[in-house]
């Protein structure tokens, strides 16, 4: 749907341009007006919508927390993309936190995967090759690799 500006005397703020809904839905980057007659644009850098919708309000842009880096900014059609800083990762089980990667594997295990923003280091038993997951081992048990950075809460 092409966005059409209203007549100058009716025009709203630049970030609030209006168009008409198509079959009751507004395009990405917009939300629907209270009376359902208009599509109102989201505010760049503040909120967004990603799909055709009948939402009364655009969604708030995520703000990257300390301990995260911003990979891409929020636009009217896409949320901010944040990533854990080097040496930390975000688990599926606790997506609100960037956790510190382990610095090494327990005794009798060997590292087969590095710390990434999405996963801790991966350790396997030397003999069996089976994976190990769990808490960071005690210092005296570790075979050190690259050091991690402190974890910070993530939004």
């Amino acid at each position: 749907i092409t966005q059409q500006d209203l007549a100058p005397q009716q025009r709203v703020a630049p970030q609030q341009k209006r168009s008409s809904p198509s079959e009751g839905l507004c395009p990405p980057g917009h939300h629907i007006s209270e009376d359902g007659r208009d599509c109102i644009s989201c505010k760049y850098g503040q909120d967004y919508s990603t799909h055709w919708n009948d939402l009364l309000f655009c969604l708030r842009c995520t703000r990257c927390d300390s301990g995260e880096v911003e990979l891409s900014p929020c636009t009217t059609t896409r949320n901010t993309v944040c990533q854990c800083e080097e040496g930390t990762f975000r688990e599926e089980d606790s997506p609100e936190m960037c956790r510190k990667c382990r610095t090494g594997c327990p005794r009798g295990m060997v590292k087969v995967g590095d710390c990434t923003p999405w996963s801790d280091i991966e350790c396997v038993h030397k003999e069996s090759g089976t994976k190990h997951s769990g808490e960071a081992p005690a210092v005296e048990e570790t075979v050190t690799s690259s050091p991690g950075t402190p974890a910070s809460p993530c939004s």
């Epitope: 939300h31 919508s49 919708n53 009948d54 969604l59 939004s155």
Partner: nanobody, 124 residues
Framework: EVQLVESGGGLVQAGGSLRLSCAAS????????MGWFRQAPGKEREFVAA????????YYVDSVKGRFTISRDNAKNTVYLQMNSLKPEDTAVYYC?????????????????WGKGTLVTVSS
């Protein structure tokens, strides 16, 4: 995760006023749109009012326009519903809800959280 607790309900005479509060726990309160819904005895739950994450945009169902006002204080993690010129037909349990947004029909979008409700009774 957000926990919501409503308060401020009670018995009031027609024409009177009440102010409902909804206190939220959780540091992400300001990320959510907030809504008030109500359910009268034997009836479906009804969308009453909502406002966006900043408080800058509001929505009201026609039956409460000009009488009810929704507002929020992000510093206090609280959303309010000021109800004036109450009518017997406003009698219901009032629920507070948090979601990414709400559809025109009141359907929550994204993760949604609900309080247990507070009873408002308007006598004639």
């Amino acid at each position: 995760e957000v926990q919501l607790v409503e308060s401020g309900g009670g018995l009031v005479q027609a024409g009177g006023s009440l102010r409902l509060s909804c206190a939220a726990s959780g540091r992400t309160f300001s990320n959510y749109a907030m809504g008030w819904f109500r359910q009268a005895p034997g009836k479906e739950r009804e969308f009453v009012a909502a406002l966006n994450w900043s408080g800058g945009s509001t929505y009201y169902v026609d039956s409460v326009k000009g009488r009810f006002t929704i507002s929020r204080d992000n510093a206090k993690n609280t959303v309010y519903l000021q109800m004036n010129s109450l009518k017997p037909e406003d009698t219901a349990v009032y629920y507070c809800a948090a979601a990414g947004s709400f559809s025109l029909g009141g359907r929550p979008y994204g993760d949604d959280y609900w309080g247990k409700g507070t009873l408002v009774t308007v006598s004639s």
